[in-house]
């Protein structure tokens, strides 16, 4: 039985040209996390593997930085980055847990952050 839950930064907004940290956290399970995938809709941004480290998709290599922790920093934001992002935790023996974050990239200087995690 899968008992874990994923907490995320929730719905967040950021300014065009700025950067944002996407973070998830898996809790309430003793399952071992073996890999975390970060995806935007159906597009893979990055993978963090427990044994192999980080792999950044070539199309995002110029504006994605790993961290903090298993999080992902997305830089040089454009309005096209608005949309859903998913953290997919591969665990043993539970299986897969998925968290969702909605990012809105704003033209204006009014941008509110989600407050579940500490985001610089």
């Amino acid at each position: 039985m899968m008992t874990g839950t994923i907490e995320t930064t929730g719905n967040i907004s950021a300014e065009k040209g700025g950067s944002i940290i996407l973070q998830c956290h898996l809790s309430s399970t003793t399952a071992q996390v073996t890999q975390v995938n970060w995806e935007q809709q159906d597009q893979l941004l990055a993978i963090c593997n427990a044994d192999l480290g980080w792999h950044i998709s070539p199309s995002f290599k110029d504006r994605v930085a790993p961290g903090p922790g298993l999080g992902l920093t997305l830089q040089s934001l454009t309005v096209n980055d608005t949309g859903e992002y998913f953290c997919i935790y591969h665990t043993y023996p539970d299986g897969t847990y998925t968290g969702r974050i909605f990012l809105e990239v704003l033209e204006s200087s009014v941008a509110e952050h989600g407050a579940r995690f500490q985001i610089p």
Epitope: A50, W54, H55, A65, P68, G69, Q118
Partner: antibody, heavy 117, light 107 residues
């Protein structure tokens, strides 16, 4: 097994700059964040910043943003930290450390920097 | 910045005893905390990640616990080789920050 070999001790005059190195082996250099940490008896362990050699992106502690510059040479699997405008407060042991799975899992042996006036 | 406070700078214990080193974060860091051991003259060594998971090769007498803002490293059946400084560190957000350290002394 990951291994980090840091350059030797440095004795440098105040006002000058120094560049120390951290040669990585035993893993894929471009797949892990490399962090730098300062240790002094008074301030303990302080995080300076990190670089992801896969694309060169850096994050700095605001305290060290005008003091330290992090770079990486993927051809030699070596990370570098340059410290500029040295003062006595920069005298410390500096560690490079590779971020593994949710911790700084591998550490170099440290480089001792002594700034003389 | 998130401040990690280790209120006890020194702790004295005897061989075979059980000792708990505590660390308090100034903000919620979930379980994004690691513990390190630094023996005299050596580099730090990672013991615990994600607050409670032991690194491979770390003896099972080392155990981590806690979440949110309060974290504990417990050493059971203390051995002479455990004489060292112990540091907590948060990796919830940049800049990563460390506790001031707790020096474990053997009576």
């Amino acid at each position: 097994q990951a291994y980090l070999q840091q350059s030797g001790a440095e004795l440098v005059r105040s006002g000058a700059s120094v560049k120390m190195s951290c040669k990585a082996s035993g893993y894929t250099f471009t797949s892990y964040n490399m962090h730098w940490v300062k240790q002094t008896p008074g301030q303990g362990l302080e995080w300076i910043g990190k670089i992801f050699p896969g694309n060169g992106f850096t994050d700095y502690n605001q305290r060290f943003r005008d003091k330290a510059t992090l770079t990486a040479d993927t051809s030699s699997s070596t990370a570098y930290m340059q410290i500029s405008n040295l003062t006595s407060e920069d005298s410390a042991v500096y560690f490079c450390t590779r971020e593994g799975w949710l911790s700084l899992g591998y550490w170099g042996q440290g480089t001792t920097l002594t700034v003389s006036s | 910045d998130i401040v990690m406070t280790q209120s006890q700078k020194f702790m004295s214990t005897s061989i075979g005893d059980r000792v708990s080193v505590t660390c308090k974060a100034s903000q919620n860091v979930v379980t994004n905390v690691a513990w390190y051991q630094q023996r005299p003259g050596q580099s730090p060594k990672a013991l615990i990640y994600s607050a409670s998971y032991r690194y491979s090769g770390v003896p099972d007498r080392f155990a981590g616990s806690g979440s949110g803002t309060d974290f504990t490293l417990t050493i059971s059946n203390v051995q002479s080789e455990d004489l060292a400084d112990y540091f907590c560190q948060q990796h919830n957000s940049y800049p990563y920050t460390f506790g001031g350290g707790t020096k474990l002394e053997i009576k």
